[in-house]
């Protein structure tokens, strides 16, 4: 018989204890929230903030500017100097809650926990291949604003997600706040709105549209608002609450809601449930048909898909997916089954779900029973009754009015249960040739960039590297400038290439040349390397 | 009734620059955005960009960024358009144009009677 | 930048006909389409915005359909007057954009 070489296991092809340092940003506090931006002429920056200050590096990393945010009272608050002279509010550290551009001027907006959440605009002054942050405008017009309407009021302490659209001459600020009693009863900031800015950048204009949780449920109904983004039509925003008004609160759910990107109105608000379950491919015994539900989404990111995955979701190879991580509750604690599962939701999907919904709701005949759902926000009703109405008069549209979605939209594990006790806390998903990769954040501080495959059983890594010695947990939002990631842990920004950070941890020389082609990695020597870091021979086609 | 008084047609020579204006009479000049619009001969309109008179915040079609500069002045209600390093690619009449809110929509409803500039040795 | 894509270039009809020029959208603009008349020698002037909705002063002959991505507009019962040049233009997203213009001509 003839001999053969000994075949090495896939793991030990790979060491992931391999120390890769990349280029971060010591930022002096716990990074809030981070946001990139990229002009049309290779000027870009990197938006950091932290307690009472906002900072601006170039695409290196390196400090530009930076801006005191906070004490809201103090006389070293730059921005709230900008609100002309105080008191303006109780005073108190401002953590910003918002950090969102706004393409059309172009513009930073930051928004923070103090003076009423209000917001501050700041544009952007390019100088060769950085930008700077020209002096702030204070989004807050006195004489327009009282605690029951309150339009320059956007910011919750408990949490908002912001969208920026443009439509016509005015950007529109799609906004999505978690309240409580306290803060709905000072200068609230509304559950679901859509808010113009003023072309005089003096704030809001008043009369916007708006949904929010109704007094009586405020107390036991909290809804935790964990992404918010725009693709073609609409902008969605995905939230983690109570699976219903009535029953136990702590019994968790996740739902889409979409909104219209070219109509500034809420009458076509809608609500779909998500499902993500951990189905093994072997069920155990006692385990739920259907597989285990993953209820509680922890983080969420939309991309167009490579050919590979487009192929396996049965969608066209550059559509837009929404993928999301999701755990089994809030504390995300270990159960039977992976810690996190990863769930790929294809937009066109959801809004075909979304429009046969309607069309259960508004077109006769409607099947007797079906409410129209949402009655944290408004009064119960029928099918295809408005809330709180016994039926339709003559010159309303049930469609114009919000509706939850009768059915939802349930998807398996992407990664067949393969995270195992991997705690997952960030995710930005990118397509690299026809390959989609989702690089991934971790509650001990690693990145862990994945293929997204569904039909393996073993993971696809590009790479999987500690980010520093902290082990502090990556935070939920990432950005893209060019072809880096950057990912807050603690005080700390990182910056990450989306090939990953190298080809070190690829231990044989087969392995290494069965990377993917756009990592750039090479045999050299004894070591698997990209180019730049081969000063002698460097082969890519084959193995000594 | 209100009215875009644009200034007179413009016969200038290549690499040199042209400040044609756009005066506004009957409605403040500070509330609605001023556009302006490029048509060369016997061709469709080209949107340049918008300035708003309350701010002077501006806003540039990409295309037209290194070619044109929008100002105003407030005191004469009047918007002027600079055009920079002529070329004869820039022969063409431009429109000035107020946009307005219509509803939650936007027009530009209101046009100068445009400003022809040729360029030429 | 959103393409506008206008059809036809050009039109012939005679006078008391109907006709109806089609403007695309590369992408999702909602409703913010406006159509403009320009006469030989004058600026632009607004017949339709929000897609749909008649300026002040204009015919009822003219009128206007669609949202999303598909547009038209029609003219009834054509008079002497009309056999000009039409255009769209969106403004939902900057750099606003025309399509391309239709001439109408008398047959």
């Known amino acids: 018989e003839d001999w053969q070489c000994p075949r090495t296991p896939y793991a030990a092809s790979r060491d992931f204890d391999v120390k890769y340092v990349v280029p971060s940003f010591s930022a002096g506090g716990l990074v809030q929230a981070m946001v990139t931006y990229e002009g049309d002429r290779n000027e870009s920056a990197v938006f950091v903030a932290i307690r009472n200050r906002l900072h601006v590096l170039g695409p290196d990393l390196k400090s530009v500017q930076s801006l005191a945010t906070g004490p809201a009272g103090d006389p070293g608050c730059q921005t709230c100097a900008a609100c002309g002279p105080g008191p303006h509010g109780p005073p108190g550290d401002t953590d910003t809650k918002v950090l969102v551009l706004d393409p059309a001027l172009p513009a930073l907006v930051s928004c923070g926990s103090s003076l009423q959440g209000r917001c501050f605009l700041h544009d952007l002054e390019p100088q060769g291949t950085a930008v700077h942050l020209a002096a702030p405008a204070c989004l807050f017009s006195a004489h327009h604003n009282r605690p029951d309407d309150c339009p320059d009021c956007v910011a919750s302490p408990l949490g908002t997600r912001v969208t920026v659209v443009e439509q016509g001459q005015a950007s529109y600020f799609y906004v999505a706040s978690s309240l409580d009693a306290a803060v709905a009863a000072s200068f609230s900031p509304r559950s679901v709105s859509i808010r113009r800015l003023k072309a005089d950048a003096s704030g809001f204009a008043p009369g916007f549209v708006a949904l929010s949780v109704l007094p009586k449920h405020l107390v036991s109904y909290s809804i935790e608002y964990v992404h918010s983004f725009h693709t073609g039509a609409f902008v969605y925003f995905l939230t983690v609450q109570p699976a219903s008004v009535t029953d136990d609160p702590s019994a968790l759910h996740t739902r889409l809601a979409r909104l219209s990107a070219t109509e500034p109105e809420l009458g076509d608000y809608r609500e779909l449930v998500l499902d993500c379950r951990f189905a093994p491919k072997r069920r155990r015994r006692g385990a739920p048909e259907g597989g285990q539900p993953y209820p509680v989404l922890r983080v969420a990111h939309s991309a167009p898909v490579g050919a590979q995955l487009a192929t396996e979701l049965s969608i066209a190879e550059g559509q837009e997916v929404l993928f999301g991580v999701f755990v089994t509750g809030k504390d995300g604690g270990p159960g039977v089954g992976p810690n996190s599962v990863v769930c790929a939701f294809p937009i066109d999907l959801l809004d075909t779900l979304i429009d046969e919904g309607v069309e259960r709701c508004c077109e006769s005949p409607v099947h007797p029973g079906l409410r129209r759902g949402l009655d944290f926000f408004q009064s119960p009703s029928f099918c295809p009754n408005p809330p709180g109405l016994e039926a339709l008069s003559p010159n309303t549209s049930c469609r114009h009015f919000p509706l939850l979605v009768s059915s939802s939209f349930s998807r398996v594990d992407l990664f067949n249960g393969l995270l195992g006790p991997v705690q997952v806390t960030a995710l930005y998903v990118t397509r690299l040739d026809n390959v989609t990769v989702a690089h991934m954040g971790t509650m001990d501080g690693r990145i862990l960039q994945v293929e997204l495959v569904r039909s393996l059983n073993y993971l696809l890594y590009v790479s999987n590297f500690s980010l520093g010695d902290s082990g502090q947990p990556v935070q939920r939002d990432v950005s893209r400038l060019g072809d880096h990631l950057l990912f807050a842990s603690g005080d700390q920004v990182f910056q990450v290439p989306i090939q990953g950070p190298g080809c070190r941890h690829f231990l044989t020389c087969g392995r290494c040349l069965r990377a993917w082609h756009f990592m750039g990695c090479g045999w050299c020597g004894n070591m698997c390397g990209q180019q730049k870091e081969c000063p002698g021979s460097w082969q890519q086609d084959h193995c000594p | 009734q209100i009215q875009l008084q644009q200034s007179g047609p413009e016969l200038v020579k290549p690499g040199t620059s042209v400040k044609i204006s756009c005066k506004a009479s009957?409605?403040?000049?500070?509330?609605?955005?001023m556009n302006w619009v490029r048509q060369k001969p016997g061709q469709g309109l080209e949107w340049i960009g918008r300035?708003?008179?309350?701010?002077?915040?501006?806003r540039y079609n990409e295309k037209f960024r290194d070619k044109a500069i929008l100002t105003v002045d407030t005191s004469s209600s009047t918007a002027y358009m600079q055009l920079s390093s002529l070329t004869s690619e820039d022969t063409a009449v431009y429109f000035c144009?107020?946009?307005?809110?219509?509803?939650?929509?936007?027009?530009?409803?209101?046009w100068g009677q445009g400003t022809s500039v040729t360029v030429s040795l | 930048d959103i393409q506008m894509t206008q059809s036809p270039a050009s039109q012939s009809a005679s006078l008391g006909e109907s006709v109806t020029i089609t403007c695309l959208a590369s992408?999702?603009?909602?409703?913010?389409l406006a159509w403009y008349q320009q006469k030989p020698g004058k600026s632009p002037q607004l017949l339709i915005y929000a897609a749909t909705s008649l300026a002040d002063g204009v015919p009822s002959r003219f009128s206007a359909s669609g949202s999303g991505t598909k547009f038209s507009f029609k003219i009834d019962s054509l008079q002497s007057e009309d056999f000009v040049s039409y255009y769209c233009?969106?403004?939902?997203?900057?750099?606003?954009?025309f399509g391309g213009g239709t001439k109408l001509e008398i047959k």
């Open positions: 992408q999702t603009i909602g409703t913010w």
């Open positions: 300035i708003y008179p309350g701010t002077d915040k501006t």
């Open positions: 009957d409605y403040t000049l500070t509330d609605f955005y």
């Open positions: 144009a107020r946009s307005a809110y219509y509803g939650n929509y936007v027009a530009m409803d209101y």
């Open positions: 233009q969106q403004l939902y997203n900057t750099p606003w954009t």
